[in-house]
């Protein structure tokens, strides 16, 4: 650890803390010798778990919380990148505070980057939640996008669709939503770059560039949608597929093409 004046981390997670925590659950008191009704685990404060992407400067402390309850009291364990996470997997270990359903990692370093999953379970059920940790330089850095967004969507013809792209960037990023298209039957232009259509971009006319909304979708709008984010340091992009299905025996609607700007665009997958 960086501080010789502070004790080494406990080798094993410890619940020996005096937290009087609103979030902690205690087993229901039994009355008349009857067993309490079984309850599968559930989140007690899901609103505190909404921030999934945590971009943290090196050396800082990270605290992930999964406040839960259930009957009997659920157990809590943590995975890193889908595998069992043991204290000796990182220098300085980590602390699990069972009273507050939290894991604490001090003095983070780049090797701490990854996905951290809490698993809360009892004999009646299991729930899990994943946080994404990125350890960043405070100085300007490339944009970082939350994993899993935008998400693939399958919707019925005529529905409205919303794609979301969560961005962490310093300096201010430029966000573009692109769709891969065909021009004269070809997806690739003469310059060997894919054809894309710019659907939306951050700027004066975009109220919320992190969200792309498509109204009354047609089959022609099926395909790959790309969230491309750039700043002067670099760029990042992630894509999702839209599948538009239509009921059988229904006449195919006329395809409306919007007069949006076409361009050649180099896109890294």
């Amino acid at each position: 650890r960086p501080s010789p004046t502070l004790p080494e981390q406990d080798a094993l997670p410890s619940s020996e803390d005096d937290d009087d925590d609103d979030d902690s659950s205690s087993e229901e008191k039994e009355t008349d010798n009857t067993k309490p009704n079984p309850v599968a685990p559930y989140w007690t404060s899901p609103e505190k778990m909404e921030k999934k992407l945590h971009a943290v400067p090196a050396a800082k402390t990270v605290k992930f919380k999964c406040p839960s309850s259930g009957t009997p009291n659920p157990t809590l364990r943590w995975l890193k990148n889908g595998k069992e996470f043991k204290p000796d997997h990182r220098i300085g270990g980590y602390k699990v505070r069972y009273a507050t359903w939290s894991i604490i990692m001090d003095s983070v370093v780049p090797s701490d980057k990854g996905n951290y999953t809490c698993i809360v379970e009892n004999e009646y059920g299991s729930i899990n939640h994943t946080y994404q940790l990125d350890v960043v330089e405070r100085s300007p850095h490339r944009p970082i996008l939350q994993a899993g967004l935008p998400a693939n969507k399958t919707v019925a013809l005529g529905s409205n669709v919303e794609f979301m792209c969560k961005v962490y960037s310093d300096p201010q990023p430029h966000i573009q939503w692109l769709k891969h298209i065909e021009v004269n039957g070809s997806k690739i232009g003469p310059d060997n770059l894919p054809y894309v259509q710019i659907l939306k971009h951050s700027g004066i006319n975009s109220s919320d560039a992190e969200v792309l909304t498509l109204f009354n979708v047609t089959e022609a709008q099926s395909g790959e949608y790309v969230c491309k984010v750039s700043n002067y340091i670099g760029e990042a992009n992630q894509s999702a597929w839209l599948t538009v299905t239509r009921p059988a025996l229904e006449e195919r609607p006329a395809v409306m093409t919007s007069p949006l700007y076409l361009e050649h665009h180099h896109h890294h997958h």
Epitope: H54, V56, T61, R138, S139
Partner: antibody, heavy 116, light 109 residues
Framework: QVQLQESGPGLVKPSGTLSLTCAVS?????????WSWVRQPPGKGLEWIGE???????SYNPSLKSRVTISVDKSKNQFSLKLSSVTAADTAVYYC?????????WGQGTLVTVSS | SYVLTQPPSVSVAPGQTARITCGGN??????VHWYQQKPGQAPVLVVY???DRPSGIPERFSGSNSGNTATLTISRVEAGDEADYYC???????????FGGGTKLTVLG
Amino acid sequence: QVQLQESGPGLVKPSGTLSLTCAVSGGSISSNNWWSWVRQPPGKGLEWIGEIYHSGSTSYNPSLKSRVTISVDKSKNQFSLKLSSVTAADTAVYYCARATDWFDHWGQGTLVTVSS
Amino acid sequence: SYVLTQPPSVSVAPGQTARITCGGNNIGSESVHWYQQKPGQAPVLVVYDDSDRPSGIPERFSGSNSGNTATLTISRVEAGDEADYYCQVWDSTSDHRVFGGGTKLTVLG
């Protein structure tokens, strides 16, 4: 045992620039820590000024950001604070400190008075 | 920016328990650290990461953090505990460090 020692003028004229240096001994400034400045006006509370990582990455208190510069000199194992356009309100004890998420080592502090 | 609110003063008789609070929006999601400062001296870390003690700090000092309030508890208070106490967090949203306004602990008698 890491030790920090502030040095610099104890008196600065209004509109001038306050300059302080913090010498780090017993440990490397290139460790996984942030090197911070905190001040305390007479009879008042602690105020975080800003900090620097050995890579040169910095973060500043928004209320002071336009006037503050923190720099690091790895060859001398020290870091420095410059605060421009000072007024009497900048009179305070200035501490340098080592930090991760918390401050685990502090200098003893140096009183800087802004007066003509 | 993030604000931490502490009571300006707390008084307690020797041998009793002192509780100093630190309020902040959803502070339970942050890691809270506590410092003791005696007149003319630099602050000293007494609790970090909500409830951990650095070596050399008596077990009488403990901490908790939940919801919108963190608490520093000093049991069996002694005259030597009289000092100013500050809470501090690194606000992960703004990426800035923040101190509470400080609480003066007075030991009566």
